[in-house]
């Protein structure tokens, strides 16, 4: 890939004195930018889902919306559930900031989190009975 030119004044990541901590401005620059209009895919999908508020004051962001599939099977055009197919969550690994030590206002540690962002319809795993 093409490396972006680095300011000569930037610290060297290989340096043993390279900081393990960084300053982060938590004021989001494009906070008020309208992201794509909220769609109703969660209802129209053949694997519909509901969104649930996951709130944790020890985390930034403190509120993350997660999807839960409504059905084990998938929904046909008439809204009936068909078990020849399965609804499964689409999961995405994200990075969040975890307060460390706990309850501290301005001290965080990066943490990986697996979140479900929606559901999709898949063919089931076929298991053969011996």
């Amino acid at each position: 890939g093409i490396a972006s030119p680095q300011n000569p004044g930037c610290p060297n990541a290989e340096d043993k004195n390279f900081p393990r901590t960084v300053m982060v401005n938590l004021n989001i620059r494009n906070r008020n930018t309208n992201s794509k209009r909220a769609s109703d895919y969660y209802n129209r999908s053949s694997s519909p889902w509901n969104l649930h508020r996951n709130e944790d004051p020890e985390r930034y962001p403190s509120v993350i919306w997660e999807a839960k599939c409504r059905h084990l099977g998938c929904v046909d055009a008439d809204g009936n559930v068909d078990y020849h197919m399965n609804s499964v969550p689409i999961q995405q690994e994200i990075l969040v900031l975890r307060r460390e030590p706990r309850h501290c206002t301005n001290s965080f540690r990066l943490e990986k989190m697996l979140v479900s962002v929606g559901c999709t319809c898949v063919t089931p795993i076929v298991r053969h009975v011996a």
Epitope: N50, H52, N54, E66, K68, C69, R70, H71, L72, G73, N80, V81, D82, Y83, H84, N86, S87, V88, P89, L114, S116, P124, I125, R127
Partner: antibody, heavy 120, light 108 residues
């Protein structure tokens, strides 16, 4: 009123067959996924099988796959469970249950149950 | 295969709050329902979709689900609440419904 009534239980020898029935009344039977759930004496609930509203798709628990068959007759508001090659561990009270229209993880109506005893 | 784990028994004094837990790997990503079963009777749905209460179920029954644990809470527990309580979800990998093995609630 809205109810499910099971029948067909009894004492049967290992290796033999039995057919359970569940009569539904008071609701639009043909619009619901239906299930069979069993409970061995003094034990936990165990899901057995389900059938979609139209009878075209079915799922089975591992312990009964290949031996039990679920079916339904929407014109008769009836659910069935054909049990073949019965084993002692199939001894249980068998309940038919209605799946909630709001999603699978809920059985919102249960029958009174019918006892199946597999013994020689 | 997926498993749901419940404590075998929970005891509570009348009028107090009873909490019955149900644990499973990443359970927050699944819907959980709860069933009450009194001796010699069929199970009755008391909570579905983690937190929802069917009509006819008293308001003292509530549910929650986060992390690896779903919880059924009965506030102001009454003698009539003494029963076995089962949690349930589904497992898409085995395409089956999964029950916990039940918790016997004793009202002292």
């Amino acid at each position: 009123q809205v109810q499910l009534v099971e029948s067909g239980g009894g004492v049967v020898q290992p290796g033999r067959s039995l057919r359970l029935s569940c009569a539904a009344s008071g609701f639009a039977f043909g619009s619901y996924t239906m299930h069979w759930v069993r409970q061995a004496p003094g034990k936990c609930l165990e899901w057995v099988t389900l059938i979609s509203f139209d009878g075209r798709s079915k799922l089975y628990g591992d312990s009964v796959k290949g031996r039990f068959t679920i079916s339904r007759d929407n014109s008769k508001n009836s659910l069935y469970l054909q049990m073949n090659s019965l084993r002692a561990e199939d001894t249980a009270v068998y309940y038919c249950a209605r799946g909630s229209v709001r999603g699978e993880a809920a059985f919102d109506l249960w029958g009174q149950g019918t006892l199946v005893t597999v013994s020689s | 295969s997926y498993e749901l784990t419940q404590p075998p028994s929970v005891s509570v004094s009348p009028g107090q709050t009873a909490s019955i837990t149900c644990s499973g790997d990443n359970l927050r990503t699944k819907y959980v329902s709860w069933y009450q079963q009194k001796p010699g009777q069929s199970p009755v749905l008391v909570i579905y979709q983690d937190t929802r209460r069917p009509s006819g179920i008293p308001e003292r029954f509530s549910g929650s689900n986060s992390g690896n644990t779903a919880t059924l809470t009965i506030s102001g527990t009454q003698a009539m609440d003494e029963a076995d309580y089962y949690c349930m979800t589904w497992d898409v990998d085995t395409t089956s419904m999964i029950f916990g093995c039940g918790t016997k609630l004793t009202v002292l």
